[in-house]
Interface confidence: low
């Protein structure tokens, strides 16, 4: 057991820089994936930089499956927003796929084989949860 | 930065119970994979219990690729041995695939989609490194 000391991340999470990441082992729609992250005191993946993107691309390099991230929009006339309400920085990546489709449950972004796609939020996919690493001694 | 305190596992590794695990992002033959783990002060994956197996199966559930583990044998008349020289406990899992083949480079075991297979060690695959977690305060 770790004495007098909190680990940067809980068991089964990956610690990278200032964040902890958890790759889900089940497949759910976007809203359910979001709930699962929230229940772990986390949010769905937010990519802030090309370094973040590089890390995630590398971490899923041995998977051909899609992973929901915390990026969505109501319909094509709305902007892409992260869960915290901040907009997507357009230089980070280009969103492919169903970008001009309108779905009742909204349009959500997933990452697959290094590329980001727009898709119907009601579909089931794996997901990536993210939270701040604990980088202070307790 | 973590003060007065060592994290159980380095960045990018997954901490689970008493061990740290790293899923390689490149694909190499078994010997090269072994060298890469050694360079990180680790060994290729060793499965000691059904709990270990359950964790690994879950951790690779979103991949359809093979991952080398630290289990090999010179030829079919030799026993399966882990890198530390200990024999495989037969109740843990059944090895499928090329179990009766003889290869110049030996026969190595990989895990893929929850099952363990025997294959020519010269082939390239992803791999899983493992080392003891640091569970003491520094």
């Amino acid at each position: 057991r770790v004495a007098n000391c909190s680990a940067p991340c809980p068991q089964d999470w990956i610690w990278h820089e200032e964040n902890c990441y958890l790759f889900s082992t089940g497949s759910f729609n976007w809203e359910k994936s979001q709930e699962k992250c929230l229940s772990l005191d986390a949010k769905l993946l937010k990519i802030n930089s090309t370094a973040d993107l590089d890390f995630i691309q590398q971490a899923i390099s041995y998977s051909s499956f899609p992973f929901w991230m915390g990026l969505s929009r109501r319909n094509p006339s709305y902007p892409w927003l992260w869960e915290d309400g901040s907009p997507l920085m357009p230089h980070l990546f280009r969103i492919r796929g169903a970008v001009s489709q309108t779905y009742p449950s909204g349009t959500c972004a997933y990452i697959q084989r290094g590329a980001v796609y727009a898709e119907n939020c009601i579909l089931a996919a794996f997901s990536i949860c993210q939270k701040k690493a604990n980088l202070r001694a307790q | 930065r973590v003060a007065n305190c060592s994290a159980p596992c380095p960045q990018d590794w997954i901490w689970h119970e008493e061990n740290c695990y790293l899923f390689s992002t490149g694909s190499f033959n078994w010997e090269k994979s072994q060298e890469k783990c050694l360079s990180l002060d680790a060994k290729l994956l060793k499965i000691n219990s059904t709990a270990d197996l359950d964790f690994i199966q879950q951790a690779i559930s979103y991949s359809s690729f093979p991952f080398w583990m630290g289990l090999s044998r010179r030829n079919p008349s030799y026993p399966w041995l882990w890198e530390d020289g200990s024999p495989l406990m037969p109740h843990l899992f059944r090895i499928r695939g090329a179990v009766s083949q003889t290869y110049p480079s030996g026969t190595c075991a990989y895990i893929q989609r929850g099952a363990v297979y025997a294959e020519n060690c010269i082939l390239a695959a992803f791999s899983i490194c493992q080392k003891k977690a640091n569970l003491r305060a520094q």
Epitope: S64, F65, G97, P104, Q112, Y117, I122, A124 | -
Partner: antibody, heavy 129, light 111 residues
Framework: QVQLVQSGAEVKKPGASVKVSCKVS????????MHWVRQAPGKGLEWMGG????????HVSQKFQGRVTMTEDTSTDTAYMELSSLRSEDTAVYYC??????????????????????WGQGTTVTVSS | QSVVTQPPSVSGAPGQRVTISCTGS?????????VHWYQQLPGTAPKLLIY???NRPSGVPDRFSGSKSGTSASLAITGLQAEDEADYYC???????????FGGGTKLTVL
């Protein structure tokens, strides 16, 4: 490009079992939702069972529960459907089918939205005494 | 008896427009599950014609269109051609049955 190749025609006696295979190429089986549908002579399509994205497992249609077993051999990327206690009304063409999604990437469970765009060639099963 | 119903047959002259209805219930089409349409030419395996209520896979002519409203869906074929003579099936998911359901099929005859 996903392809599904099924086993050949079978003639069976009433009470026997039949096991139809469906070999996947172009993808791995675990990336796909596999379903089984049959069509009796001159009749419509009937869903027998397949992968259910609601709980991420295979479901068998209530009509066939207890008689249909769906299995997968991931080492050979082959799906199997076994129908037991055969009767004459089981004479039909049996199809395996799957969905590859908009990007053609074969993602399990997405057939909810995309429908079944890849079908096997069909296996004729004749039950006759 | 299918839980999703289609008319057994429809017909039309070349160049005409025909529609095929697909009526479900609150546990399938009415629950928001998408409807897919398949075309089966004589002696061949069915082919996906419309997915997600109204989307055409690549290679399907724009003469074919789908729509959905409430517990029903419909397939429309405009500019009818002789090669459209086939059986057409709708399909949806049914939550009460925990499985896929097909309509009974509609035979389209081009007069």
């Amino acid at each position: 490009q996903v392809q599904l190749v099924q086993s050949g025609a079978e003639v069976k006696k009433p009470g026997a079992s039949v096991k139809v295979s469906c070999k996947v190429s172009g993808y791995t089986l675990t990336e796909l939702s596999m379903h089984w549908v049959r069509q009796a002579p001159g009749k419509g399509l009937e869903w027998m069972g397949g992968f259910d994205p609601e709980d991420w497992s295979n479901h068998v249609s209530q009509k066939f529960q207890g008689r249909v077993t769906m299995t997968e051999d991931t080492s050979t990327d082959t799906a199997y459907m076994e129908l037991s206690s055969l009767r004459s009304e089981d004479t039909a063409v049996y199809y395996c089918l799957t969905s590859t999604g908009r990007q053609g990437k074969g993602v399990r469970g997405w057939d909810y939205y995309y429908g079944m765009d890849v079908w096997g060639q069909g296996t004729t099963v004749t039950v006759s005494s | 008896q299918s839980v999703v119903t289609q008319p057994p047959s429809v017909s039309g002259a070349p160049g005409q427009r025909v529609t095929i209805s697909c009526t479900g219930s609150s546990s399938n089409i009415g629950a928001g599950y998408d409807v897919h349409w398949y075309q089966q030419l004589p002696g061949t395996a069915p082919k996906l014609l419309i997915y997600g209520n109204s989307n055409r896979p690549s290679g399907v002519p724009d003469r074919f269109s789908g729509s959905k409203s409430g517990t029903s869906a419909s397939l429309a074929i405009t500019g009818l051609q002789a090669e459209d003579e086939a059986d057409y099936y709708c399909q949806s998911y049914d939550s009460s049955l925990s499985g896929w359901v097909f309509g009974g099929g509609t035979k389209l005859t081009v007069l």
